[in-house]
Interface confidence: low
């Protein structure tokens, strides 16, 4: 399918690339003492970057420090020191730079204030950081200011006194709309959801919190839940974990109408030491992790139906260390339906798994062509690729980056990995897939930092090394051939690659510092690849590609979730610019339905290796512990429900008698009197 990757050999060397890149390499030296640098992009396609450098001496008595603020409006080629715009104030790095949604051009920086002050201080900009306004707050912020996704003038923040503060005019004036607030989040349509403690404190009242909602920025409120442990938003779903009456367990409840009505999710309840985690959610469905009892480090992934109520077991022994801990769960954004994660085997080895159908089936990653199985493999000819992600990084393995994919670089996935029966602790190599994870090839030897530019037209990499570096590698053919470019004669201690989010840019910034004796200087080099890709791509540069194609002879080839998609993709041999305005061209076509397009509805399950749903024997003739919309009602089903997001039409339609599932409703979540009602079977 493809040859082994090469660096400067067996590959056509791009003509004059050194001269072209040298002319487009811009150095900026930051003349300050800072210990840390944070970088934020302001807006989309604006070229505006804000860089905040901070230096802090963490003294118990007085913490003193200095911040400098720099601004670029040409994608990092030149920076201007704009510290004077924030009155040379020390900025609190733990709050970061709060950048407004979309292209609002809004920025909020939170300043350090002296101990006795009445409230905090922010600097606000609404013109892409050209100007800042200093505003003194009537409270000390506990969290970063949160913008409403619908209206960037609306802000919310929690204070150190647990007050919920709201601004309707981009932080100019603030109003405390509620006290004793533990957690607050923006929902759709400028709704604010928040939990409050009733008696003692957020920690003491965990499991006895109330969930409130305001739809008018704090004029009126509605209590939408009691006995709350925590809540979360995912896609169009609002989730709450609620304490049970009888014991210390809790259950997930789901609402799709902003908390007016709730249904108990058909998921196992969890005890005090366990947790639920929303791994991914979209408008159609949710991936939910449910922790196993005990300190096992694993749990089970469940996938939801379109209501977020009925869940199918998706993957056992899913690696997830602790609450807020590490999981390798990764959404491969370059191909619909693809996710990669890790499982923990009985022997405590970690293995990578991939699903191409949104969690319906999981399998091992195919062994890359021409690769040898490592020492972890029992059979030296049969093994698979194992991907390093968050867990490996947390374990300080030599893995500088998590897997990378971009929606507009169709099919491309880049990740560190090893080839064997399980993840290896040996130094990993970098692998690439150009078909969304179906097949893989070794891309680079040893660990690297990598990024995608020009919607996949260029891949850039830098070797991960303890020594100073001065070489950047790049590929114009999806990682098959690599060229090396010396971007500076004075090697730097590399700290990061920065390119504009969205992978549409052709600029890459290499950040690091130089040290002479032990004086440090931050420096950035921005390389513009526009002259490497010197012409715009034309029609002939693209070729059609059927996603998820595994069996070209089959009429259902490429069908995932009821439809197939054909993409126009750049030929590997074409060296041209997709350009900033590139839109992924795809042609969807609907597939006929089969049983694979349906999940088993409540009270039904699929026996292993079977395609039909059968009634769960333990539920036959029993009252079901199931609560739909928080009130007693008849639940009718034929045992099947279409998988969320599935678009199949015609073909097989599972027809069978409609059953009436009588049940009791055991949740007293919202209205204890109504919710405790029972029906007798």
């Amino acid at each position: 399918r493809r040859g082994a990757p090469a660096e400067d050999q067996d590959c056509g060397r791009l003509p004059d690339f050194i001269a072209k890149l040298t002319n487009n390499t811009h150095q900026h030296v930051f003349d300050d003492l800072s210990g840390s640098v944070s970088l934020s992009w302001v807006g989309d396609s604006t070229g505006v970057i804000l860089v905040l450098t901070t230096f802090q001496v963490p003294l118990v008595i007085v913490s003193f420090g200095q911040s400098k603020l720099y601004r670029s409006e040409d994608y990092g080629k030149n920076f201007k020191d704009i510290t004077n715009l924030i009155n040379n104030t020390f900025i609190r790095t733990e709050f970061g730079m709060a950048i407004g949604p979309e292209n609002s051009g809004k920025v909020i920086l939170t300043a350090e204030v002296s101990g006795g002050s009445r409230g905090g201080r922010v600097f606000r900009s609404s013109d892409f950081a050209k100007n800042f306004v200093q505003t003194d707050l009537p409270f000390h912020p506990l969290t970063q200011m949160m913008y409403s996704p619908q209206n960037s003038d609306y802000l919310l923040a929690l204070s150190t006194e647990n007050g919920l503060w709201v601004s309707k005019n981009f932080g100019e004036k603030w109003e405390e709309i509620h006290k004793a607030v533990c957690l607050a989040k923006w929902g759709p349509n400028n709704i604010i959801f928040f939990t409050t403690h009733v008696n003692g404190s957020c920690k003491a009242d965990l499991g006895a919190l109330e969930l409130w909602r305001t739809s008018d920025l704090g004029k009126t409120f509605k209590t939408i839940g009691v006995k709350i442990y925590s809540f979360g938003l995912g896609g169009r779903f609002l989730f709450a974990s609620v304490m049970a009456d009888k014991d210390t367990t809790r259950r997930i409840h789901v609402s799709t109408d902003q908390g007016d009505t709730w249904s108990m999710a058909q998921l196992p309840s969890v005890g005090q030491e366990q947790f639920y985690s929303i791994l991914a959610a979209n408008e159609d469905m949710v991936f939910m992790h449910v922790d196993e009892p005990g300190d096992t480090g694993f749990g089970t992934i469940f996938t939801s139906d379109d209501r977020g109520i009925v869940y199918s077991k998706s993957l056992d022994r899913h690696l997830y260390t602790t609450t807020g801990g590490e999981t390798d769960f990764t959404n491969v954004t370059s191909l619909r339906g693809v996710y990669i994660t890790s499982t923990l085997s009985e022997d405590n080895s970690i293995q990578s798994m991939i699903t191409f159908d949104q969690g319906g089936r999981w399998e091992h990653l195919r062994k890359p062509e021409n690769s040898k199985c490592d020492a972890t493999a029992k059979n030296k000819n049969e093994c698979s690729l194992h991907i390093h992600a968050s867990y490996s990084i947390s374990q300080k393995l030599n893995v500088p980056m998590a897997p990378l994919s971009e929606p507009n670089a169709v099919g491309i996935v880049i990740a560190h990995g090893s080839v064997g029966d399980a993840i290896s602790v040996m130094v990993p190599d970098v692998y690439i897939s150009d078909d969304g994870g179906y097949s893989w090839a070794k891309m680079l030897e040893g660990p690297h930092y990598y990024t995608i530019l020009d919607s996949g037209g260029i891949i850039v990499a830098i070797e991960h090394s303890n020594r100073p570096i001065n070489v950047i590698k790049f590929s114009t053919d999806e990682g098959q051939c690599w060229q090396s470019y010396v971007f500076t004669q004075e090697p730097i201690y590399f700290t990061g690659l920065a390119s504009e989010p969205g992978a549409r840019s052709m600029n890459i910034s290499i950040w690091g510092f130089t040290e002479s004796f032990i004086t440090r200087q931050w420096v950035s080099y921005t390389v513009d690849f526009k002259d490497i890709l010197e012409r715009n791509c034309e029609e002939d540069d693209y070729t059609t590609w059927l996603a998820h194609s595994t069996d070209p002879g089959d009429y259902k080839d490429g069908c995932i979730l009821g439809y197939k998609e054909q993409f126009l993709r750049l030929r590997k041999s074409s060296v041209c610019q997709n350009g900033r305005d590139y839109v992924v061209a795809k042609q969807p076509s609907v597939c006929p339905c089969s049983l694979e397009d349906f999940l088993c509805d409540f009270g039904y399950f699929r026996p292993e290796n079977a395609s039909e749903c059968v009634e769960q024997p333990e539920l036959k003739g029993h009252e079901l512990e199931f609560c739909l919309y928080g009130k007693e009602e008849h639940l009718t089903t034929n045992g099947y429900r279409k998988i969320p997001g599935d678009k199949c039409q015609g073909g097989m339609n599972p027809a069978r008698e409609v059953k009436d599932l009588k049940k009791k409703c055991t949740s007293n979540f919202l209205n204890p009197t109504k919710q405790n009602s029972k029906s007798n079977s």
């Epitope: 230096f55 963490p58 003193f64 200095q66 590399f494």
Partner: antibody
Framework: QVQLVQSGAEVKKPGASVKVSCKAS????????MSWVRQAPGQGLEWMGI????????SYAQKFQGRVTMTRDTSTSTVYMELSSLRSEDTAVYYC??????????????????????WGQGTTVTVSS | EIVMTQSPATLSVSPGERATLSCRAS??????LAWYQQKPGQAPRLLIY???TRATGIPARFSGSGSGTEFTLTISSLQSEDFAVYYC?????????FGGGTKVEIK
């Protein structure tokens, strides 16, 4: 080469003030912080405080708070340490030392201390009535 | 403040022998620790920074180890010029603090 040259010995009466200077050369003065450390006769080292030559911001050990003032003059690449309300127990050798003060290594998450790498020769301050 | 405790207060060693000096912090200082050597009438001299990295010009016989709360300075084979007082210093949390020192004397 990099060096810090301090002012000469001082003899002061109790209740008086002393101002010790420390002139830096051989490196960019504003690129590094400066700490002051003292050592009483036969005793160990005691950190007094630190100054940032860029903005002149300071932080002092609680023990010296209210009595010590650290300043700098960027035009002459000199830092000063003034100690007021002197008492006999302030008799010591006072050192200035170039101090990187926890500059992060590769990125904001990791902190790394490089040590006070260059010291002045010391200034003896004797407080006696 | 973080208290740094050095032991022993005095270490008697013959030239050519190995010397092991200990430094303990009252709470974790990560690897933000330095070791200094001071000879009578002289300013301190930086030996080790970052708990284990030798400063420029420091001979290889000096080595540092440890992180968190327990640190060690080892002089593999004592030379006559190594007899001096050695101090550890933390820079994890202000105020910076020094240990009381260990005097390495000729046995």
């Amino acid at each position: 080469q990099v060096q810090l040259v301090q002012s000469g010995a001082e003899v002061k009466k109790p209740g008086a003030s002393v101002k010790v200077s420390c002139k830096a050369s051989g490196y960019t003065f504003t690129s590094r912080y400066m700490s002051w450390v003292r050592q009483a006769p036969g005793q160990g080292l005691e950190w007094m405080g630190i100054i940032n030559p860029v903005g002149g911001s300071t932080s002092y050990a609680q023990k010296f708070q209210g009595r010590v003032t650290m300043t700098r003059d960027t035009s002459t690449s000199t830092v000063y340490m003034e100690l007021s309300s002197l008492r006999s127990e302030d008799t010591a050798v006072y050192y200035c030392a170039r101090d990187p003060s926890g500059i992060a290594a590769a990125g904001p998450a990791s902190r790394y201390y490089y040590g006070m790498d260059v010291w002045g020769q010391g200034t003896t301050v004797t407080v006696s009535s | 403040e973080i208290v740094m405790t050095q032991s022993p207060a005095t270490l008697s060693v013959s030239p050519g022998e190995r010397a092991t000096l200990s430094c303990r912090a009252s709470q974790s200082v990560s690897s933000n620790l330095a070791w200094y050597q001071q000879k009578p009438g002289q300013a301190p001299r930086l030996l080790i920074y970052g708990a284990s990295t030798r400063a420029t010009g420091i001979p290889a016989r000096f080595s540092g180890s440890g992180s968190g709360t327990e640190f060690t300075l080892t002089i593999s084979s004592l030379q006559s010029e190594d007899f001096a007082v050695y101090y550890c210093q933390q820079a994890r949390l202000g105020p910076w603090t020094f240990g009381g020192g260990t005097k390495v004397e000729i046995k």
